[in-house]
Interface confidence: medium
């Protein structure tokens, strides 16, 4: 299977296919073809942070001990095979599930080369019928596989170590003269096959593990830690049109769903039916004056609805997104044909209840009315349902177009790609990346808290065993209270004999304060599930308060906000664990522990096991975090 940049190389077409049919109307424009593609864009920041956090400079470790990187692009075969229909030599039918095996069988096709990626800044993989047959079926007599993969290890390994900029991989239907709708159907099948980018970086050394399913496997007994990323659409059911809105004039098949189903030749009793305007004229469907009749029907085709008494009929859009307040539903309906019924539109957001859309009629020419309803910018992907509710006897209704317009603002957001990350334990247990390096052992042998964590940059993973790990205080006079790193030597703290960051707030005549400042951390990746984790303890009586302040370096100006606070404490002298989501941090930042106390205070304040989650820098949520106070 070939791969190409920019222009894209074919992933195979049958040598002698069926006779050529009319192509897509004027074929597909560049924009339309682009809309058929699935784009994977791994941001440059991910590469920078992966390099800084996981890949030490090459001179600092022996070649044998250097982390390794692998990558692939995987698609489920079943939807692709369904598109092709039954093929000779396929040992399980396209409609049936893949063979039930312990792991999904896969066949790996060659991905792209580094040389081409360097030249064109993006890798284009075109998938056609031949590649599907090669990747999912293979030679006659071989068992069909459940997974088609492109090997991208060379490419990912180069990009993560030496590459610059973002990694862009475009998967699209192979372009060739073929029957109407082919590219659209192939694109839909590609989407249904849930294409996903799989990356792996693992620290080499000794261990024993079977490789996780669907990943290019490292040698099973040769890694100390193993991180895996899957990049896929956070809403795989979104249509390719979700980026550009939807316009359906019924002249060509649309991605709408109909209830009851659209009339076909096998179904003679019909509700929804697509008919050309000439046929409508011959059928004498309109009651208007004869002279007007030819003008009343739009050119091309439209949708006719034949309803019985008190029935409900629905047109349903594909899954959509909107990034614009101006996103609008527009539907053209014929007034004279539906005196006894009414249209209702519903917004159906993902994971939310439906709500009605206010439809405003704008009278058009020759009896046609455009119903418009503002959709705006729902937080989640959504579908739109147009219901025609007939009342009384049989009635006819006509729809000329169904459109969702102005749903993207500026550059279109496309569907949201999530980069999900995980840590694989030696025994095969898979953890979320955030569980690694948090001072809680989640793997049976504790490898999620071992070598990799200790090699993170200063301040990321700190138990104060080796000093202040980046925490500093201003210049101190001999009598100023100071934060110290030492052990809590006390019978009551036998469960915590190691070092901690401590402050003794001994009784003072006037109020006192002490501040300690962390190392600086880089800006988290936008919309990452970023967290700060730490243990804290207050022993004795605190007449005052302790705050944790997050300071952002915003264009040279420092902006601080309190993220945690405890005051006038006289509670249990127990270590408490806290996890603070670091939302909406867009610049590099540091932390400050600020303690203030007054007369009568006799407390020890302690912090330990401070970590910044790796998710901050190596995970991308599909959805942007929505803060409570945005309106």
């Amino acid at each position: 299977v070939g791969s190409g940049m920019g222009t894209g190389q074919r992933a195979g077409s049958p040598a002698a296919g069926p006779p050529l049919q009319p192509r897509e109307p004027l074929s597909y424009s560049r924009l339309q073809r682009k809309s058929l593609a699935v784009d994977f864009v791994v941001p440059s920041l991910f590469r920078v942070y992966a390099r800084d956090l996981l890949l030490p400079p090459s001179s600092s470790e022996l070649k044998a001990g250097r982390p390794e990187a692998r990558g692939s692009l995987a698609l489920d075969c079943a939807p692709l095979l369904r598109l092709l229909g039954p093929a000779p030599g396929v040992s399980w039918t396209a409609g049936s599930p893949a063979p039930a095996e312990a792991r999904t069988l896969s066949r790996v096709l060659k991905g792209g080369s580094v040389r081409k990626l360097r030249r064109a800044k993006q890798l284009v993989l075109e998938l056609g019928e031949e590649a599907i047959l090669e990747g999912c079926v293979g030679p006659p007599g071989e068992a069909a596989v459940g997974l088609l993969q492109f090997n991208l290890s060379e490419l990912f390994s180069w990009w993560i170590r030496q590459g610059e900029g973002r990694l862009r991989i475009r998967l699209m239907p192979e372009k060739k003269a073929s029957e109407v709708g082919r590219e659209g159907r192939l694109s839909a099948a590609i989407r249904a096959s849930q294409p996903r980018l799989l990356f792996q970086i693992f620290g080499t050394g000794h261990s024993s593990l079977e490789s996780p399913t669907n990943m290019p496997s490292p040698s099973p007994d040769y890694f100390t830690w193993n991180l895996t990323w899957i990049m896929k659409d956070s809403f795989p059911f979104l249509s390719h049109r979700s980026r550009y809105g939807l316009e359906c004039s019924f002249d060509f098949p649309c991605e709408l769903e109909y209830s009851p189903p659209l009339h076909d030749l096998r179904n003679q009793s019909w509700s929804w039916r697509r008919i050309p305007s000439e046929e409508a004229s011959q059928m004498d469907l309109l009651d208007g004056p004869g002279a007007e009749r030819s003008k009343e029907m739009p050119r091309g085709s439209f949708l006719l609805l034949n309803t019985s008494a008190d029935s409900k009929h629905t047109i349903l859009s594909p899954w959509m997104r909107s990034s614009s307040e101006h996103c609008t539903l527009a539907v053209s309906v014929h007034r004279h044909l539906q005196p006894s019924g009414r249209y209702i539109a519903q917004l159906l957001p993902h994971n939310e209840a439906a709500r009605e859309i206010l439809l405003m009629p704008t009278p058009g020419k020759h009896g046609w009315t455009v119903l418009q309803g503002r959709i705006g910018r729902p937080d989640n992907p959504f579908r739109v349902a147009l219901e025609y509710i007939s009342s009384g006897n049989r009635s006819l209704s006509a729809v000329d177009f169904f459109a969702l317009k102005n749903c993207s603002e500026g550059t279109s957001p496309g569907s949201k790609m999530a980069l999900q990350s995980s840590f694989t334990c030696w025994n095969g247990t898979v953890l979320q990346l955030g569980q690694a390096c948090d001072f809680h052992q989640d793997c049976a042998q504790g490898e999620d808290e071992s070598q990799m964590c200790r090699k993170l940059p200063v301040g990321f993973y700190c138990n104060f065993e080796d000093g202040f790990c980046g925490w500093t205080q201003g210049t101190l006079s001999p009598h100023t209270p100071q934060w110290q790193v030492r052990t809590l030597k006390d019978a009551r703290f036998q469960d915590h004999q190691d070092h901690a960051l401590l402050l003794s707030t001994t009784d003072v005549p006037a109020s006192e304060s002490a501040t300690v400042t962390s190392a600086t951390f880089p800006a988290p990746i936008k919309s990452s599930p970023c967290e700060l984790r730490m243990s804290w303890l207050i022993r004795g009586v605190l007449r005052g308060n302790v705050s944790l302040v997050l300071v952002e370096n915003k264009t040279g100006k420092e902006q601080g906000r309190m993220v945690w606070h405890v005051a006038a404490y006289e509670g249990l002298s127990l270590w408490q664990w806290m996890v603070l989501p670091l939302l909406d941090v867009s610049d590099r930042f540091w932390l400050q522990m600020v303690a203030w106390w007054g007369q009568g205070s006799r407390a020890i304040v302690a912090f330990d096991n401070i970590s910044i989650s790796l998710d901050c820098y190596l995970t991308i949520s599909g959805e942007d975090k929505i803060l409570q106070n945005t309106a």
Epitope: Q372, I375, R377, A631
Partner: antibody
Framework: LQLQQSGAELVRPGASVTLSCKAS????????MHWVKQTPVHGLEWIGA????????AYNQKFEGKAILTADKSSSTAYMELRSLTSEDSPVYYC?????????????WGQGTTLTVSS | DVQMIQTPSSLSASLGDRVTISCRAS??????LNWYQQKPDGTVKLLIY???RLHSGVPSRFSGSGSGTEYSLTISNLEQEDIATYFC?????????FGGGTKLEIN
């Protein structure tokens, strides 16, 4: 952001009156303008809405024929004409801008216009 | 139309009190519920949209909760400026409908 409504009106039964709502501080055509009636008996009632961009309107069935909504893009002003007035039409009328996502809330309101229908 | 029943119709509380107002819909409105404040001078402001999301500029002492048909507005630490009438409104089905209002007074 402001929705400035016209002043109080005193009109005779059977007559008509036009209330205005001038928008400022945002792009007028980007948002629908809705009208809400408030009476001591019925509380707040939605009358209808206009999309200033297209001129499209939608009405609560209860107010079909009673209220006519229009908008003038050049002056960023929405109008509501109330016809065949009776004493039942004598409360306060508000214009309100609608935000479309979340839950279709009315995020900014005019200060209200008091209408008195009396002979 | 969806009926919105708001309780109580009036209530009296002291400064610093925690106050809760309830709103019940005649059918499931799927969290499409908003709360408004109307001051004695007639000024109306949006407080909370989509059950619990605070409109910009609204103090954090206001909060909303609920689901299905039952919803509530809570003012956690009553202040003098909170003297007003509060209305709920559903945005799930057309026409939009409002609760009868709760007049809040200070003891």
């Amino acid at each position: 952001l402001q929705l400035q409504q016209s002043g109080a009106e005193l009109v005779r039964p059977g007559a008509s009156v036009t209330l205005s709502c001038k928008a400022s501080g945002y792009t007028f055509t980007d948002y629908e303008m809705h009208w809400v009636k408030q009476t001591p008996v019925h509380g707040l009632e939605w009358i209808g809405a206009i999309d200033p961009e297209t001129g499209g309107t939608a009405y609560n069935q209860k107010f079909e024929g009673k209220a006519i909504l229009t908008a003038d893009k050049s002056s960023s002003t929405a109008y509501m004409e109330l016809r065949s007035l009776t004493s039942e039409d004598s409360p306060v009328y508000y214009c309100a801008r609608r935000r479309y996502y979340g839950s279709s809330s009315f995020d900014y309101w005019g200060q209200g216009t008091t209408l008195t229908v009396s002979s | 139309d969806v009926q919105m029943i708001q309780t109580p119709s009036s209530l009296s509380a002291s400064l610093g009190d925690r106050v809760t107002i309830s709103c019940r819909a005649s059918q499931d409105i799927g969290n499409y519920l908003n709360w408004y404040q109307q001051k004695p001078d007639g000024t109306v402001k949006l407080l909370i949209y989509y059950t619990s999301r605070l409109h910009s500029g609204v103090p954090s002492r206001f909060s909303g909760s609920g689901s299905g048909t039952e919803y509530s507005l809570t003012i956690s630490n009553l202040e003098q400026e909170d003297i007003a009438t509060y209305f709920c409104q559903q945005g799930s089905a057309l026409p939009p409908t409002f609760g009868g209002g709760t007049k809040l007074e200070i003891n």
